[in-house]
């Protein structure tokens, strides 16, 4: 679609005569008829295939034609066409005398014609005017002409439709050749795709307007390159979405089991040393003078029976003092002045001389201990129970009462986390020190083999037109998420183009 424009500039008819040579009375009131048609080697009468236009009376005899409107008409004259410009044309311009006000062809006498010119040739679409002058024996016409495209039409023959837009269907202006020129921040064939924030992660991020970076589910941050841990996660992080990798000191599927009770809760009082001994369990090693599970009880320093060999203990303000029985000395009555001759070994213990008889050592029978076999064995003194188990004397034997999560004679065994079959879909369970691990069969993944995986149906890039491919894990098929303007199971069909697009 375009317009052939004809600009009449000057008409000279000095003698004021008609084509027949007869003079006009009182002068030649001149108007023009224009016929535009397809190229003819010899311009002949016939339909004006490209259009016709007439002017009002523009002047008498000789006159210059003003630009734009003149007596209600327009200059340049417009001859619009609704087809592809062929690049060639034929043009007939007739000057007529109007004796009255009626300019219709049937209202004029046939000899009212002043002059007729006919030209033909090639004409490319463009902004530049072609100047021409046609002279006959009696008249001269100066004019110029050009072909330009209608609004929204572009290209060498005005066949490319392009209408600038800035909406859901595109964000562009039109170049002189009719190609789209995307507005800043937009890209794609129809400038429908926003250009995301620089650095926005290609897979994890997307945008609905320029310089934006929105994250797909499971991702976060300015550039969508940080994952979001699992919904139930308490004290953990992730390296891929929905994971829960426990912070130091935490365990369990959702990192909600406290493996570092000492640091997180500081249960030991009065300067005691705290040792973690499993999930939510700990042991306090008390400083001298304190007792209790959390060393919360102050005790007499004599309560720990520090005096050996039957020495008696006396509490003092700054500690204690041992009163030793005859034959012993030292801070704790630990040194003996006796020899085997004094029969110092009790309860059937046998005496062995040491250091040439200056000292001795007692070898005690079972169930007795002490440097003189004077003490009945407390089988719990050696703290045989592991993992914070409680030792109980049971006559000649002992037993350990274990904390939750431990078993075995000495509470040395973790209760198997695998006992409750936590691995889904036939996964193999392995006990670890701080939990368990599932080895998943083919087709499953996740901490508990709960996620079904499959052949990646998207691996072959089945989606067209920059669509996003998603694998449907339930059916091992793919789903294409089409960008605006495309439909079809693979986004292969464009939609929404204006029907007047010629392609």
């Amino acid at each position: 679609s375009g317009v052939f424009q004809l600009q009449l500039q000057e008409f000279i008819n000095e003698r004021g005569v008609l084509a027949s040579g007869r003079p006009c009375e009182p002068g030649c009131r001149t108007f023009f008829r224009v016929c535009l048609k397809h190229f003819q080697a010899v311009v002949s009468p016939g339909p004006c295939t490209f259009g016709t236009v007439s002017t009002p009376v523009l002047g008498t005899n000789s006159f210059a034609v003003r630009d734009d409107s003149s007596g209600g008409g327009r200059n340049p004259l417009q001859l619009p066409f609704n087809f592809t410009w062929p690049g060639t044309f034929s043009l007939i311009i007739e000057a007529w005398h109007a004796p009255g006000d009626d300019l219709r062809p049937e209202a004029l006498p046939p000899d009212a014609l002043i002059s007729k010119i006919a030209i033909q040739g090639s004409l490319a679409v463009g902004q530049n005017w072609l100047l021409d002058e046609q002279t006959s024996t009696l008249t001269r016409l100066r004019y110029s002409y050009r072909v330009i495209c209608s609004d929204n039409y572009y290209g060498d023959n005005c066949s490319r439709l392009c209408k600038k837009r800035n909406d859901h269907f595109g964000h562009y202006v039109c170049q002189p050749d009719g190609n789209l020129s995307c507005l800043p921040g937009w890209t794609g064939e129809y400038c429908q795709q926003p250009i995301c924030l620089s650095g926005c992660h290609e897979q994890n991020g997307y945008c609905s307007k320029p310089a934006e970076c929105l994250c797909r589910p499971g991702w976060q941050g300015r550039l969508c390159n940080e994952c979001i841990p699992h919904n139930g996660c308490r004290h953990g992080t992730c390296s891929t979405p929905w994971q829960c990798t426990c912070d130091e000191g935490w365990g369990g599927l959702f990192c909600d089991q406290d493996l570092n009770y000492c640091t997180h809760h500081s249960p030991c009082k009065n300067g005691a040393t705290c040792s973690n001994s499993g999930q939510r369990s700990y042991t306090c090693t008390c400083r001298p003078g304190y007792t209790g599970v959390d060393c919360e009880l102050e005790l007499s320093e004599c309560d720990s029976n520090p005096c050996r060999n039957g020495g008696s203990c006396k509490d003092q303000e700054d500690g204690y003092h041992c009163l030793c029985p005859p034959g012993y000395y030292g801070l704790h009555c630990e040194h003996s002045t006796l020899s085997c001759a004094d029969s110092p070994c009790f309860n059937g213990g046998s005496c062995r001389e040491r250091n040439q008889g200056a000292n001795y050592a007692c070898e005690c029978p079972p169930n007795f201990t002490g440097s003189n076999c004077e003490k009945k064995v407390d089988r719990c003194t050696s703290n045989p129970c592991a993992n914070g188990g409680q030792c109980l004397n049971r006559g000649p034997s002992r037993m350990c009462r274990c904390r939750p999560g431990f078993t075995g004679t000495y509470c040395e065994l973790h209760v198997s986390d695998c006992a409750r079959n936590p691995c889904a879909h036939g996964g193999t369970c392995h006990d670890l020190e701080n939990g368990l691990m599932c080895t998943c069969p083919a087709g499953f993944s996740g901490r508990r083999c709960e996620v079904r995986t499959s052949i990646d149906a998207c691996a072959s890039s089945p989606c067209f037109n920059r669509a996003t491919c998603y694998t449907d894990l339930s059916t091992d098929t793919f789903v294409c998420n089409c960008p605006y303007g495309f439909v079809g199971s693979r986004c292969e069909f464009p939609v929404g183009l204006p029907p007047s697009f010629p392609w």
Epitope: L214, C215, R222, E226, I228, H235, G236, V479
Partner: antibody
Amino acid sequence: EVQLVESGGGLVQPGGSLRLSCAASGFTFSNFPMAWVRQAPGKGLEWVATISSSDGTTYYRDSVKGRFTISRDNAKNSLYLQMNSLRAEDTAVYYCSRGYYNSPFAYWGQGTLVTVSS
Amino acid sequence: DIQMTQSPSSLSASVGDRVTITCRASEDIYSNLAWYQQKPGKAPKLLIYDTNNLADGVPSRFSGSGSGTDFTLTISSLQPEDFATYYCQQYNNYPPTFGQGTKLEIK
């Protein structure tokens, strides 16, 4: 046990300001994105704003953009919502929640009522 | 923004009944859908995420199904404590949006 406790709500005149706080416990606050969700009296739930855990990136619903600011202090295990130029339509119970705009809201506080009225 | 439409808006049922609530999205949200339960004067509580995954501590009588645009929350055998308002929420597209709610009342 995860706990989110909001405070700072109250009655304010249109055009006024208010700052809501949310104290978090029972989880490692700095590891998780947080959000504010509101509920007008007798109405449904409406996401208001989100802040990431990684770099503090913020997102807002269109109707509060430029008026509300979400922020966090990981050292204090606290989330905040600064609300300026308040309007009658901002009247709602404001909930602090653990979640992002593209994840479920896993845990919620008990809510704090904001009333904007002259 | 994606519109989430729940139906029905309210329903009456008896203890022991099987109840189904539906949620429809105005465009494909894949399986990125959550369900919440809210009792009067209380905060919402996450029941189900990713369409069919039960949140920690949620009874197994609750289940979810669907994908794309049509989703369902089912309570297999209503208990007295289940009478509440239920909301669906999509988190596939920005911004996240909730359904208008379904109030479940005692018949």
